[in-house]
Amino acid sequence: TLNSVLNSNAIKNLPPPLGGAAGHPGSAVSAAPGILYPGGNKYQTIDNYQPYPCAEDEECGTDEYCASPTRGGDAGVQICLACRKRRKRCMRHAMCCPGNYCKNGICVSSDQNHFRGEIEETITESFGNDHSTLDGYSRRTTLSSKMYHTKGQEGSVCLRSSDCASGLCCARHFWSKICKPVLKEGQVCTKHRRKGSHGLEIFQRCYCGEGLSCRIQKDHHQASNSSRLHTCQRH
């Protein structure tokens, strides 16, 4: 169960948060470094583990991905897990630590030498199944080495939002991911109500921009749950 994982020695004995726990063998979940103690420093660290529930990878840190911590664990529970280092097994790009991507189920380097010229890489996304492989779909997308060194413009192929220029995020488009604009005030947004629901979108939207949150539109409060319209709204 999830709780047995959270209380295992592997979790309790994680290295300090800033000491490279990400991808460490046995580090089922990462610890959180930014802690605010009353009257203390914002970035003090604490030793005990802090599970961080999530709905999708974008809600975790750059060195993490969102998944269930155990196979056959508590249904519906996903938390931020430490990213996988090079040569570790993976099922999607976000599982691999920055500087790596998922190819044939293994995290491989995306450094400059590896990406000299252009390469072809199969990109697929899981449609509501956290354990599907990346390589099960035959659509092929050409990735340029450029995307790993300059921030992608709108429409550029990406693996994660950090690949995209300011004001853009990396979102699913058909069976690849491209840089799309972060949503502005009044634009329709997607509120994920249940685990795995974001896996069904083949035209994924970005998140709302700074100062905005995705909320039910005021005049849609009386509508049925299925037809409620969410938009990016200012506080």
């Epitope: 930014g34 809600e59 060195d63 629901s197 998140y207 905005l212 995705c214």
Partner: nanobody, 124 residues
Framework: EVQLVESGGGLVQPGGSLRLSCAAS????????MGWFRQAPGKEREFVAA????????VYADSVKGRFTISADNSKNTAYLQMNSLKPEDTAVYYC?????????????????WGQGTLVTVSS
Amino acid sequence: EVQLVESGGGLVQPGGSLRLSCAASGGIYRVNTMGWFRQAPGKEREFVAAINWSGGSTVYADSVKGRFTISADNSKNTAYLQMNSLKPEDTAVYYCAAGNGGRQYGHSRARYDWGQGTLVTVSS
């Protein structure tokens, strides 16, 4: 910066119930997860429960599972911790935590910011 204000703490008898509230304001647009932690006198702060606002998934510590329930009201930017069947060992300062771990904000790890805490005392 997210501001968090906890309320609902107090003195309760063993077996009793309390409901803690945590109102978030300020940089709330950055928050995707809310949590509760506690710190008993002379002990380390420990995780109690957390909830993801968009996916609704919840995580609990073994010591409170089945007794405590975490929930959130998005429209009020408020998280709650319903505590039932309270025991003397639940006595602690309870801290609300707001998680803004999104990689879009450049954090390498998911992280929490903290409120000032509210004292819960379980005693007869």
